[in-house]
């Protein structure tokens, strides 16, 4: 014989239940009928991007919901969140019925990622959450590409790169000039300034600044963006000895990067060429 619905049995025993249950007890009337898989709404022909889950009654396969998608309710909101997500929000109770195009019992809400911290993917990309990494991995696999795995918690480490390099400067002796350099990297790079000295036969050596120069100041600050550092070399007053090539050098555990600019010292302003190199400053 086909099982009667549990709801009917509960109603039949309502009097007895009222006697047995304490008044404070709240019992949901959500029930599951027999499972009838062929009556379940069919899954998309190309399958589920975020994998499959089952309805509240464990009968019907359904596509797992992604971040920000509705979950737990009836009708269009019916559904369970993909692994690593949870269904949160408005608690609206509804009666449930499964196995016949029905939404299972539950609340209506949206799927949010359980872990809301950034993670580093095996593709070298930083994802805002593990859920977004999983979604990207599913998309990659659906395109026939390699799955993306989580390499580490937090942002991906990356070698430094120069965001804004220093610019060449022409100025007269006695002037106050500065070079600036903006770099980025994860972990945040260490920025230093060197003066490049070219010896005989093109041999290059560097002198770490500021050294003992009393007219030269180095300043470094974090930013303007996360994992960025900006540094300045301030020369005041400018002398002939300050002419030369200045290198901004950034390094972290993942590598190093550098960029350089020249300071040219002239006796008078009219000696500064009208057509200066691109990016040159007074």
């Amino acid at each position: 014989m086909e099982r009667p619905s549990l709801r009917a049995l509960l109603l039949g025993a309502a009097g007895l239940l009222l006697l047995l249950l304490p008044l404070s007890s709240s019992s949901s009337s959500d029930t599951c009928g027999p499972c009838e898989p062929a009556s379940c709404p069919p899954l998309p022909p190309l399958g589920c991007l975020l994998g499959e889950t089952r309805d509240a009654c464990g009968c019907c396969p359904m596509c797992a919901r992604g971040e920000g998608e509705p979950c737990g309710g009836g009708g269009a909101g019916r559904g369970y969140c993909a692994p690593g997500m949870e269904c949160v929000k408005s608690r609206k109770r509804r009666k449930g019925k499964a196995g016949a195009a029905a939404g299972g019992p539950g609340v209506s809400g949206v799927c949010v990622c359980k872990s809301r911290y950034p993670v580093c993917g095996s593709d070298g990309t930083t994802y805002p959450s593990g859920c977004q990494l999983r979604a990207a991995s599913q998309r990659a696999e659906s395109r026939g590409e390699k799955a993306i795995t989580q390499v580490s918690k937090g942002t991906c480490e990356q070698g430094p790169s120069i965001v804004t390099p220093p610019k060449d400067i022409w100025n007269v002796t006695g002037a106050q000039v500065y070079l600036s350099c903006e770099v980025i990297g994860i972990p945040t790079p260490v920025l230093i300034w060197n003066k490049v000295k070219r010896g005989h036969y093109g041999v290059q050596r560097t002198e770490l600044l500021p050294g003992d120069r009393d007219n030269l100041a180095i300043q470094t600050r974090g930013g303007p963006e996360k994992h960025e550092v900006t540094g300045w070399v301030l020369v005041s007053p400018l002398s002939k000895e300050d002419a030369g090539e200045y290198e901004c050098h950034a390094s972290n555990s993942q590598g190093q990067a550098s960029a350089s600019a020249k300071i040219t010292v002239v006796d008078a302003l009219h000696e500064i060429p009208v057509k200066k190199g691109e990016g040159a400053e007074l």
Partner: antibody, heavy 111, light 110 residues
């Protein structure tokens, strides 16, 4: 006892619309989906789809998408099958049946 | 869609003799919950179908125990130990494991 009673036979012309009813009694109407099954003269049974009596959500088999519509009048404990723009090949007996596992059937409506 | 193939198409039997109908599915009907959704229906002339057996072998109430259902995965059988006059009609197997529900072509018992 549990019963599904369908509306009487219908004689229609191609291009017309027909609406068949299936009235349920003897059980809680919204607890069980209603299925629709087509049987052409001298042929076998073909499932058309179902309607979830709790949510009103229909599911149609591919062959019955477009001109066919399932609906409900819950207060009257009645499910409906409407066929628009009738074609000769729609000539058949249409059965409603209650979930689950084909336990209860209507007597059929010949169109 | 899952194709349900019934044999024979027609079965001529003498009253009191046994009868056997085979139903084969193009895919396994074993669902992930361990249940197999295969049912048998009888449609007598001019009537609506009536369920005899559900979930392979469970006999409906009011159905005589001369009917037995058996089988698993893709091969199923309905047996009648001693055919009676009221058993005449068309027998259908139906699967409820895979969307959409599908029926066998029918076996006419005469």
């Amino acid at each position: 006892q549990i019963q599904l009673v369908q509306s009487g036979p219908e004689l229609k012309k191609p291009g017309e619309t027909v609406k068949i009813s299936c009235k349920a009694s003897g059980y809680s109407f919204t607890d069980y989906s209603i299925h629709w099954v087509k049987q052409a003269p001298g042929k076998g049974l073909k499932w058309m789809g179902l309607i979830n009596t709790e949510t009103g959500e229909p599911i149609y088999v591919d062959d019955f998408k477009g001109r066919f519509a399932f609906s409900l009048e819950t207060s009257a404990r009645t499910a409906y099958l409407q066929i628009n723009n009738l074609k000769n090949e729609d000539t058949a007996t249409y059965f409603c049946a209650r979930a689950y596992y084909w336990a209860y059937w209507g007597q059929g409506t010949l169109v | 869609d899952v194709v349900m193939t019934q044999t024979p198409l027609t079965l001529s039997v003498t009253i009191g003799q046994p009868a056997s109908i085979s139903c084969k599915s193009s895919q396994s009907l074993l669902y992930s919950n361990g249940e197999t959704y295969l049912h048998w229906l009888l449609q007598r002339p001019g009537q609506s179908p009536k369920r005899l057996i559900y979930l392979v072998s469970k006999l409906d109430s009011g159905v005589p125990d001369r009917f037995t259902g058996s089988g698993s995965r893709t091969d199923f059988t309905l047996k009648i130990s001693r055919v009676e006059a009221e058993d005449l009609g068309v027998y259908y197997c139906a699967q409820g494991t895979h969307f959409p529900h599908t029926f066998g072509g029918g076996t006419k018992l005469e």
